[in-house]
Each structure stands twice: as structure tokens, then as C-alpha cells.
């Protein structure tokens, strides 16, 4: 029996009965928040062999082992993960061992076993036999191994029953509990699974099988399951579903969902049966089961019940995330906010069409409307009193509408109104009239030439750069000295610069009136010598990085109609020189024969240029005399080498720190102080723990129904 799509057992342990007939859980299994300690011995689910997503256990009082509950759980596929993890055991107060002695494979994802005060038998499990990579496993804050005294079956009687493997240079027996060994297949099977009698399974089997070399006898499938057989790919006219089985078109068409988007059912795309078309695709017709690529962003129609959507905060803007067509009117009223421009762009940047009007008033936090970066059509089907479909009133810091060189916006019906926008130049408004096709619709009072732009430098001259010089982390630029009509009114210059991977930035990107600005700013005083051109050295830059730079003159000059005259440059794009790359990451070496080493690494995090080749150096090391000091035939006499792992649980530090011997006969001395790197690593570790715990709580706690 297949159960799903995910099972959430909480509050009442008797809900476990829901697992009674499940052989496969198509989805996740949550067992959590059972605060009353119960006797779980009568609950046993031997039929359950596969969980296709993840297993999460959290605060289940009284549960001491998972082995009795799930004696035959063999595979956790990790098709979807819980914060990158396929197995999470968190704050299980009474759990003494994991005990999943038939667990052979976690196909994707890592494990997180944290804050289980009584949990032992963690160091006796070789997770590398179950997972592909153990480097992302997080096993912290459980019962200290030295308090556990984990013993594998038969060790006390000197008749050890379990096999040994090496973990962190420790060669030891591998087991799940005092009476359950960790199963290992013969090396002749390679990556294949094996039966209880150590016969190799069919290559398409995963975890285990009931008969050797038989693709119909698998406990779970390596790739896909179809009609009782494990197959490498789904046969023709069948489709992948939930990452583990093949289904036909009829099956896919008859899946019912409780999601609000279910009116059209599941789709078939790229050989897979899925709930919705993936990003960048849209259904080929409203009742179609097939997807076609979108032209540009995929359309998403959003509607406001009350017709007018007020955007007065990031939270209200959040409701429009992903919307491309807004049915209704937009009223933007942003008085304050943190990082408001980029937040609004994030949530409203895909809107292309507004069917009603757009009104921007009292939005003192806005410097530009460029956050509506894809708006191309205002239909004006509904208009404000006076037939206005674009209305801009009293925005104290608004300086730019859009970058009209890169913007096509049409206002199909209705007029525009602008008043009391002191930093918005009238020329900017006139330009909008031309672009939007509204020229001639406005009457004289609709664009007020007195109170729009009264505090802006609207008559701008162009500053020209005269030289640029670069090194790996510096840029030197100079520009023509600007000479306004009255030289006394030129106060200084301001240089704006920022990283710009692409040549598409504008002056107002990420800028708002509340202090957020994606540009770095540097003030440059006038050179005392009138003949010297002003310039600046920008330092502390990244190597091989393109920067955008522009300069503005800071002036006082007034012209006849009381508007300030100013000057600024075009945006200049300039790249710093290449430099030495940072070190390659994750260097691993392994020997695959007596005369070969295989070395692998990842590219450096900071290439600082175009990488053309790597240099690999090696040298022979003398044999470690340490290896000859011990009698390796005597049982359990292999010394344990301790390796610092850079993290420590505070509660475990109980001894006097003054016990380390500092070489020779110097006697005890203090532990070395932590390096900055170690402190930083600890800080990041603590932060990571918090982030995970928040994610866990946010994911599983739901409000009670009213």
C-alpha cells in the first residue's frame, strides 16, 4: 500500500495507526510534539520499507528506539528534503538509539541528529555506507560518546558478530544497537545491494532484495518502479512521478489536489507527471496537461477583491510576488522603510500590466519608480475622479520616474497628474508624456511647473571623464573640471561606484530616501589649483570585477526660473585587473592502486580572473613510525587518535583546561587561545544552528483551527 503525500503524526501517539498498512510513504513522515510519554512497544510497522522524501522526529516523549517501530525501513529517498536533510532527529528526549537496523540507503540529502540528550550508538554507525557523502551530516549535542559505552553484539563475550570499518582513522565494529549489527554487503557486490544471505541483488535494486539478481524482488528501486519491476527509466507512455515510480497519462490526469491551483489538474512535462508547469513554462491551454515555454516571464494574474490594492509596506507588496498582470488599481503610499527600493522590486518587479489606475502619493521613501521595472501598460479601465489613470502627488524625494531610454510604457486611457514633487524635474514628466502616448491629454493644471522639481538640479550639464587607470584592487579616475556660471557655487564632487557584472545599471538602482543605496559614495573636494583636474583613487576593490562609476557636481547655482543647475557624468563601466586566485577548495586525494593517487578539488571561491590551468605539486613523505609502535594483533589495542574538529559543546568542558602538555617536559600549560578564524567558525556554527531551529519551528508549528 502507498500512503501519502506525506504523513504528519502529532499530539496523539495513537495516530501512528495511520501507518499500519503502508509499505511506501510517498512523501515525508513527521512524528512530532507528543509530549506525554507513552509505551510504544505495541506499535510496530514492519510493512514500511521506503519513505520517498524525508523522516523528521521532534520532541516525541517516551520513544527509546526507532527499531521496533520501523524494523524494515530500508530506503529514505530524499526526493524532497527538510532544510537539506533526509533524516532529522531533533530534541528527542528519551531516544537511546536510532536502531533502524535495516536502513541501507539515503539516496539524497544529509542527516541532522541534534540535541538528543540520551542518544547513543551514533559513533558505531558508518553513515558512509548509507549516504553518498557524509561531509554535510550534522551530529551535535547528543549524549557524549564517553558516557555511552556503546558495545556492538558479541563484543563482551569476545565473539564479535559485526563487521568493522574505518571512520576518522578509527577501525571499529559497526552496529545500530547492542543486538543489531550494521549490515554490509560483500565487496564483490560493489555498489549493489544484497540479500540477508549476502547474495548480490539486481543492479536496479536499492537497499535490499528478497532474491538475488532479480529486478522483481527488490525492496526498493535504484531508479524507478513500474508494474512490479525496477527499471532504469520509465517505459514509453509512462511518466516519472514523485521521483520513484512510473505512471500512465490516465493516472496523472486523475490525481486530485487540495491546492488552490487544482482547477486544471496535474501536468506532464519532460517525461514527468507534476503538479504545475515548472518555472518558465505555462499550460498549453486552460485544460491542457502539457506545458509550453513562456515568452518572457510567465503570466500570473492577481486580483484585489476591493479593486484597489494599497502598497504601504513591504508586507503588502509581498502579496504581489510573481504577479505579471494586476487586475485592479495600485495605490502606492510608502512613507518609510528599510531597503525599500530593492524589496519593492523583489515583490512588484514582474508586474507588466495594471488594468486600472496607478496612484503614488505621500511616498517619501521613494527616489524612483524603477522598482516597477517591467510595467509596460496601464489600461486605465478604472480612473480616479478627473479621469486620471496615473496620479503622482506629494512625494518629497521622488527624483526619477523610469529610465526612459530603456522603458516602453503605454497609458491606454486616462490622464496624468503631477503636483508637489519637489525633486522631480518637469523635463522628466514631459518625457513620460511622450513615451506613454498621453501628450495632449493633460490640461494646463495637471502638470504643475512651479511645485514639481523646485528643489532639484534639473538643468544638468555633462561631466566628462578624462582618464582611468586600474590595478588589481584600485581604480584611479579623473574628470573635466566643471565650471558653473559662478565658480563659487561649485562646492565639491561626489563619486558613486558599485560592482556591476552587467552594463545595465541606473543611477537610482536600489536607492531609497531612507538611507538605503546600492552605490558606494565618496566625496571629492575641489583641487586648490584651478588647472588641476579633479580625480579620485578608489581602493579596496575586488580583482577582476567590473564596476560602474559616475560623478556628480554638488552646486548651489540658481538659474532664472529658480531651478538649481547641476552637472553629472554618464555611467562608466571599468574592470579591475586580474590577480592571484584564492586557493582551490575541498582538495581530496585517494589511492586507487599502489602507484597512483587520484586528486580532486573544487575551483577557488575567488578566481580573480579567468582560470586557465592548475598546478599540482606532490612530494614523497617518510613513513609514519607511529604505525609500527603497536601490536595490531592484540584486540582493541589500537590507539585512538583525537582530532580537533573546531567545535565543542560548552557543557562538555568540565575538566581544568590546564592539562595540556606542551611538548618535551615542560609540564602542564594553558590551551592556546582561539584564533580569529576559529572564533568566526564558532560564530557561524551557532548562527547556523539558530537558522535551522527557526526553520524547524516555522515549518511544523501551525495555528489551531478557530
Amino acid at each position: 500500500e502507498i500512503c501519502g503525500p506525506g504523513i504528519d503524526i502529532r499530539n496523539d501517539y495513537q495516530q501512528l495507526k495511520r501507518l499500519e498498512n503502508c509499505t511506501v510513504i510517498e512523501g515525508y513522515l513527521h512524528i512530532l510534539l507528543i509530549s506525554k510519554a507513552e509505551d510504544y512497544r505495541s506499535y510496530r510497522f514492519p510493512k514500511l520499507t521506503v519513505i520517498t522524501e524525508y523522516l523528521l522526529l521532534f520532541r516525541v516523549a517516551g520513544l527509546e528506539s526507532l527499531g521496533d517501530l520501523f524494523p524494515n525501513l530500508t530506503v529514505i529517498r530524499g526526493w524532497k528534503l527538510f532544510y537539506n536533510y533526509a533524516l532529522v532527529i531533533f530534541e528527542m528526549t528519551n531516544l537511546k538509539d536510532i536502531g533502524l537496523y535495516n536502513l541501507r540507503n539515503i539516496t539524497r540529502g544529509a542527516i541532522r541528529i541534534e540535541k538528543n540528550a540520551d542518544l547513543c550508538y551514533l559513533s558505531t554507525v558508518d553513515w558512509s555506507l548509507i549516504l553518498d557523502a557524509v561531509s554535510n551530516n550534522y551530529i551535535v549535542g547528543n549524549k557524549p560518546p564517553k558516557e555511552c559505552g556503546d558495545l556492538c553484539p558479541g563484543t563482551m563475550e569476545e565473539k564479535p558478530m559485526c563487521e568493522k570499518t574505518t571512520i576518522n582513522n578509527e577501525y571499529n565494529y559497526r552496529c545500530w544497537t547492542t543486538n543489531r549489527c550494521q549490515k554490509m554487503c560483500p565487496s564483490t557486490c560493489g555498489k549493489r545491494a544484497c540479500t540477508e544471505n549476502n547474495e548480490c541483488c539486481h543492479p536496479e535494486c536499492l537497499g535490499s532484495c528478497s532474491a538475488p539478481d532479480n529486478d522483481t524482488a527488490c525492496v526498493a528501486c535504484r531508479h524507478y518502479y513500474y508494474a512490479g519491476v525496477c527499471v532504469p527509466a520509465c517505459p514509453p507512455n509512462t511518466y516519472r512521478f514523485e521521483g520513484w515510480r512510473c505512471v500512465d497519462r490516465d493516472f496523472c490526469a486523475n490525481i486530485l489536489s487540495a491546492e488552490s491551483s487544482d482547477s486544471e489538474g496535474f501536468v506532464i512535462h519532460d517525461g514527468e507527471c507534476m503538479q504545475e508547469c515548472p518555472s518558465g513554462f505555462i499550460r498549453n491551454g486552460s485544460q491542457s496537461m502539457y506545458c509550453i515555454p513562456c515568452e518572457g516571464p510567465c503570466p500570473k494574474v492577481c486580483e484585489e477583491e476591493k479593486k484597489t490594492k494599497t502598497i504601504d509596506s513591504v508586507t503588502s507588496a509581498q502579496m504581489l510576488q510573481g504577479c505579471t498582470i494586476f487586475k485592479g488599481n495600485l495605490l502606492i503610499n510608502i512613507r518609510r522603510g528599510n531597503n525599500i527600493a530593492s524589496e519593492l522590486e523583489n515583490f512588484m518587479g514582474l508586474i507588466e500590466v495594471v488594468t486600472g489606475y496607478v496612484k503614488i502619493r505621500h511616498s517619501h521613501a521613494l527616489v524612483s519608480l524603477s522598482f516597477l521595472k517591467n510595467l509596460r501598460l496601464i489600461l486605465g479601465e478604472e480612473q480616479l475622479e478627473g479621469n486620471y489613470s496615473f496620479y503622482v502627488l506629494d512625494n518629497q524625494n521622488l527624483q526619477q520616474l523610469w529610465d526612459w531610454d530603456h522603458r516602453n510604457l503605454t497609458i491606454k486611457a486616462g490622464k496624468m497628474y503631477f503636483a508637489f514633487n519637489p525633486k522631480l524635474c518637469v523635463s522628466e514628466i514631459y518625457r513620460m508624456e511622450e513615451v506613454t502616448g498621453t501628450k495632449g491629454r493633460q490640461s494646463k493644471g495637471d502638470i504643475n511647473t512651479r511645485n514639481n522639481g523646485e528643489r532639484a538640479s534639473c538643468e544638468s550639464d555633462v561631466l566628462h571623464f578624462t582618464s582611468t587607470t586600474t590595478s588589481k584592487n584600485r581604480i584611479i579616475i579623473t574628470w573635466h573640471r566643471y565650471r558653473p556660471p559662478d565658480y563659487r557655487d561649485l562646492i565639491s564632487f561626489t563619486v558613486y561606484y558599485k560592482e556591476a557584472p552587467f552594463k545595465n545599471v541606473t543611477e537610482y538602482d536600489g536607492q531609497d530616501a531612507c538611507g538605503s543605496n546600492s552605490w558606494n559614495m565618496v566625496d571629492v573636494d575641489l583641487p586648490p589649483n584651478k588647472d588641476v583636474e579633479p580625480g579620485i583613487l578608489l581602493h579596496g576593490l575586488k580583482p577582476w570585477t567590473q564596476y560602474a562609476v559616475y560623478v556628480k557636481a554638488v552646486t548651489l547655482t540658481m538659474v532664472e526660473n529658480d531651478h538649481i543647475r547641476g552637472a553629472k557624468s554618464e555611467i562608466l563601466y571599468i574592470r579591475t585587473n586580474a590577480s592571484v586566485p584564492s586557493i582551490p577548495l575541498d582538495v581530496l586525494s585517494a589511492s586507487n592502486s599502489s602507484s597512483q593517487l587520484i586528486v580532486k578539488w573544487n575551483p577557488p571561491s575567488l578566481p580573480n580572473g579567468n582560470l586557465s590551468y592548475y598546478i599540482v605539486r606532490w612530494q614523497r613523505q617518510p613513513q609514519d613510525g607511529y604505525l609500527y609502535r603497536h601490536n595490531y594483533c592484540s584486540k582493541d589495542k589500537i590507539p585512538i587518535r583525537k582530532y580537533a574538529d573546531g567545535t565543542i559543546d560548552i557543557e562538555e568542558v568540565t575538566e581544568n583546561p590546564k592539562t595540556e602538555v606542551c611538548g618535551g617536559e615542560k609540564g602542564p600549560c594553558c590551551a592556546c587561545p582561539k584564533t580569529e578564524a576559529e572564533k568566526q567558525a564558532e560564530k557561524e556554527e551557532a548562527e547556523y544552528r539558530k537558522v535551522f531551529e527557526n526553520f524547524l519551528h516555522n515549518s511544523i508549528f501551525v495555528p489551531r483551527p478557530e
Partner: nanobody, 123 residues
Framework: EVQLVESGGGLVQPGGSLRLSCAAS????????MSWFRQAPGKEREFVSA????????RYADSVKGRFTISRDNSKNTLYLQMNSLRAEDTAVYYC????????????????WGQGTLVTVSS
Amino acid sequence: EVQLVESGGGLVQPGGSLRLSCAASGRTFSSFVMSWFRQAPGKEREFVSAISGSGSRARYADSVKGRFTISRDNSKNTLYLQMNSLRAEDTAVYYCAANPRRATPDLTQYAYWGQGTLVTVSS
């Protein structure tokens, strides 16, 4: 936890009609796919019909297609099964079931079940 209570069962003559109701409480009703199953005396429980969370899509067992109609009223947290042209072989205990998020055509292990209501079709 979701509680489901069926009602509307009873004795009806062949060719007659009956409307079953299932009242749900405890969680947001619309976030569940709802279904009707039935179990005739001495037989296995079998699928009858299911409906999506919004009520926009439904599916039926071949044996009841064209005779039974499933519907739901999310504002009243209630599921319905309108049964027309009833036959003797429709005699069974009818169960209402709920499953969160979605239900595949082969799903029989629903998360929540009602106690059932008996429908007897006999002359």
C-alpha cells in the same frame, strides 16, 4: 485532528435516490481532498468517488459513473454524495475520508475516516 461524521443513509428502493452528507471539523476543510468509499457485507472496502479541495475536479469509480455526483461546500465544511438510480449492488456502509494536500488514484490509505453510514437498496 479531523473529525468526520456521515449521515443520510437508510433504506431505499432500487431506482431511487439518496443524498449522503459528511460534516468535517478540526482543520481547514478546503485543504483536504475528500472521498467516499464503501464496504459491502463480506467484501473489501472500495473507492466510490473523490473531489479536489476547491471542488472543481472530481473522479468516480466506473461502477457509479453517471449515477452518483460528489460535491462539497467549503463554507459549511460539508461533503455530499448524491446517489441516483440506485441498485441492489450499491448496498454497503459508505465511509467519508479526508486526505491532506492530494490524493492519487491508487490511494486507499486516507489520513482520516468517518464511522460510516449504512445504505440499503432493497425492494
